[in-house]
């Protein structure tokens, strides 16, 4: 059912989410920056090639179709946010060992995403919307080479930022009095 006023979501939860999204965005931007600086070396910058590579590597997108501000379905939207964060935890895990320079940034990003997923889960539990079972991890892309892992890193970081932009817009809309 579409959400009327967002009265069922506490302001403290929404503000916490906005803060966490911005932390992930900041740390994700740091990762992207480092990846882009490797772009020239590894020829990773061409958008068309990246899209094709994304298809061939099977890097999935996380949908937020239940979250449009005009007809937002609260249970569905929170569930999609949580599932999306769960997906990105797996994708970031698949990037492990991408490069020693990127390791610390990737590690921090992974924990940030886990924190945000925890926040969403807590709220779903409080609203009685938490599923009985946690989502299970689908097949993650297997990166066969250092090049694929780096290219995968560019794509995952880019997908994650797009997901966060939509999340941020939804949460900001809900946080408006």
């Amino acid at each position: 059912t579409p959400l009327g006023p967002a009265s069922s979501l506490p302001q403290s939860f929404l503000l916490k989410c906005l803060e966490q999204v911005r932390k992930i965005q900041g740390d994700g931007a740091a990762l992207q920056e480092k990846l882009v600086s490797e772009c020239a070396t590894y020829k990773l910058c061409h958008p068309e090639e990246l899209v094709l590579l994304g298809h061939s590597l099977g890097i999935p997108w996380a949908p937020l179709s239940s979250c449009p501000s005009q007809a937002l379905q609260l249970a569905g939207c929170l569930s999609q946010l949580h599932s999306g964060l769960f997906l990105y935890q797996g994708l970031l895990q698949a990037l492990e060992g991408i490069s020693p320079e990127l390791g610390p940034t990737l590690d921090t990003l992974q924990l940030d995403v886990a924190d945000f997923a925890t926040t969403i889960w807590q709220q779903m539990e409080e609203l009685g919307m938490a599923p009985a079972l946690q989502p299970t991890q689908g097949a993650m892309p297997a990166f066969a080479s250092a090049f694929q892992r780096r290219a995968g890193g560019v794509l995952v970081a880019s997908h994650l930022q797009s997901f966060l932009e939509v999340s941020y817009r939804v949460l900001r809309h809900l946080a408006q009095p």
Epitope: E19, R22, K23, F86, A114, D115, Q134
Partner: antibody
């Protein structure tokens, strides 16, 4: 209420391995990361690493990478830490701690005391 | 790694008076999202640590409002307005800006 119950004190020989446990109750285990912290007698707290039980992801402080192995059993809501190649430097109290969504450790186990002695 | 620095002991305090404990980090803990990722924990004798303050200035649930915390990106102060006997223990600051998570060496609050 949330509780983290840690296994009892351990006495081990140098070179041996030990595996300690942290049983979580009073909350859904998988959505929360579980962290481990070391405290040597009269000394500060050192973060060892954490496990994310939902995806079985582990991350370690570089200092403990070759020392600690973190695992979790979702069916029993229990986190484990194995310490290998023990030396007297590993004698300490080890705490498990649940990470809350503000990035803080909101619940702590009572600690497991490890004594390494020949 | 971010290094958190604390004095080992506070100035001995009298019950009912105020106390201050300081902490310094070698890197700013202020993130671009406006949050300062600094935390305070208290470890009472023979107990596990307990959370007092999160994100520099927020009081954890159940913590009396005698406790407060402030600071810049790198210099932080925990204040106890009216010290009680139960406040005795070791106070640790910690950072959660980036991995590895790090703690200060702890400051022992002592009574006169």
């Amino acid at each position: 209420q949330v509780q983290l119950q840690q296994s009892g004190a351990e006495l081990a020989r140098p070179g041996a391995s030990v595996k300690m446990s942290c049983k979580a109750s009073g909350y859904t285990f998988t959505p929360y990361t579980m962290h481990w912290v070391k405290q040597r007698p009269g000394q500060d707290l050192e973060w060892i690493g954490y496990i994310n039980p939902s995806i079985n992801y582990t991350n370690y402080n570089q200092k403990f990478k070759d020392k600690a192995t973190l695992t979790a059993d979702k069916s029993s809501s229990t986190a484990y830490m194995q310490l290998s190649s023990l030396t007297s430097e590993d004698s300490a109290v080890y705490f498990c701690a649940r990470r809350g969504s503000y990035g803080n450790f909101d619940y702590w186990g009572q600690g497991t005391t490890l004594t390494v002695s020949s | 790694d971010i290094v958190m620095t604390q004095a080992a002991f506070s100035n001995p305090v009298t019950l009912g008076t105020s106390a201050s404990i300081s902490c310094r980090s070698n890197k700013s803990l202020l993130h671009s999202n406006g949050i300062t990722y600094l935390y305070w924990y208290l470890q009472k004798p023979g107990q596990s640590p307990q959370l007092l303050i999160y994100q520099m200035s927020n009081l954890a649930s159940g913590v009396p409002d005698r406790f407060s915390s402030s600071g810049s990106g790198t210099d932080f102060t925990l204040r106890i307005s009216r010290v009680e006997a139960e406040d005795v223990g070791v106070y640790y600051c910690a950072q959660n800006l980036e991995l590895p998570l790090t703690f200060g060496a702890g400051t022992k609050l002592e009574l006169k």
